[in-house]
Amino acid sequence: LIIGFGISGRHSITVTTVASAGNIGEDGILSCTFEPDIKLSDIVIQWLKEGVLGLVHEFKEGKDELSEQDEMFRGRTAVFADQVIVGNASLRLKNVQLTDAGTYKCYIITSKGKGNANLEYKTGAFSMPEVNVDYNASSETLRCEAPRWFPQPTVVWASQVDQGANFSEVSNTSFELNSENVTMKVVSVLYNVTINNTYSCMIENDIAKATGDIKVTESEIKRRSHLQLLNSKAS
């Protein structure tokens, strides 16, 4: 969390941003909130990016003002116009690219004063893994697949029964480049699996950590997966 203040005493307002990550090829949100004003027409929101000459986005007098917008963001940004009045200056970013990573500044002017806060935005690819029993294999084998990751993640297997065990000798992980030549499909196979046990396939890079669990018993198979972004720090 980054909290920024205006420059001088009573003419400053608090602006808060949250560091976040964008999944390339999808929508991203750059989060920013501020002390609200009662009049929409008095609020100015400017989003800037370090190293970019034009603005990322500007909203003033109740509408978007894009005359100063940098070409790389044209048609790719929008604020949540109906939420500006309650202090939400967050920016929606279309079709996140690797080049969108960097330091952004959310700069706010209201009738109460000015304020700004920086936001670190990371970009990459992350997806939920799915763990299945590989019935084609000669022995009891689990297969963990996740369609899109970048940068290349690490994959670690764990088991509820054999906590702390190192499965690197009995697993094999491969990374296959996807058609757009950036992201990769992650496939990891775990051999010599025993029933009545829960196995976890953990995939992690510097942006996200995802886990796929599978519980194999004689009567059923239960699966669960979750994903967590690693750099959601507020400022």
Partner: antibody, heavy 121, light 107 residues
């Protein structure tokens, strides 16, 4: 309610130009992109380009660059498509459509009724 | 430019059938694929955007899915009013592109 009302049918000779209008109502005209799409008789949809009336920014399908001109008059909330050097294969229904997402260029969510342009000698 | 290859170009089906239409993008990955329904003499109608998000008022028998370069529109149980032509649209890049269309006819 978002409404896009287009101008009437046109008959033009090869080599001439045509200007189709699209009058918008029910939303803030300057805050949304407007796209243009055409459909030749019995054929599929073909994207021509789009314009952001709030700044006059445009994007064009390479096929129409230099022949299509997109403009917008914010005082009347009207978008225009002008197509020059017409040929018989330009005979089509021309649609305008609002792009979802305000300044963010989304999918086309509201459409005009279409304008038939016939090019014939 | 990204091209969208839609298949099949036409299909015959009966009321109650499950119908699947696919679009393949020539390159890249993004979720910005929309699906439209068009009836003769009418403007296209947006059914689905962002791969799988249903437009308000569109029946839940319509669904969208896909990732990478492959995207699918599914009609779970075809109704008489669903006989029409369907188009996919790629709108993630600077230049938009429609698929060639799929005509769904009565068997």
């Amino acid at each position: 309610e978002v409404q896009l009302v287009q101008s009437g049918a046109e008959v033009k000779k090869p080599g001439a130009s045509v200007k189709v209008s699209c009058k918008a109502s029910g939303y803030t005209f300057t805050s949304y992109w407007i796209g243009w799409v055409r459909q030749a008789p019995g054929q599929g949809l073909e994207w021509i380009g789009d314009i952001y009336p709030g700044g006059g920014y445009t994007n064009y399908n390479e096929k129409f660059k230099g022949r299509a001109t997109l403009t917008a008059d914010t005082s009347t909330s009207t978008a225009y498509l002008e197509l020059s050097s017409l040929r018989s294969e330009d005979t089509a229904v021309y649609y305008c459509a609002r792009l979802d997402g305000s300044s963010y260029r989304g999918a086309m969510d509201s459409w005009g009724q279409g304008t038939l342009v016939t090019v014939s000698s | 430019d990204i091209q969208m290859t839609q298949s099949p170009s036409s299909l015959s089906a009966s009321v109650g059938d499950r119908v699947t239409i696919t679009c393949k993008a020539s390159q890249g990955f993004n979720k910005y694929v929309a699906w439209y329904q068009q009836k003769p003499g009418k403007a296209p109608k947006l059914l689905i955007h962002y791969t799988s998000t249903l437009q308000p008022g569109v029946p839940s028998r319509f669904s969208g899915s896909g990732s990478g370069r492959d995207y699918t529109l599914t009609i779970s149980s075809l109704q008489p009013e669903d006989f029409a032509t369907y188009y996919c649209l790629q709108y993630g890049n600077l230049l938009y592109a429609f698929g060639q269309g799929t005509k769904v006819e009565i068997k």
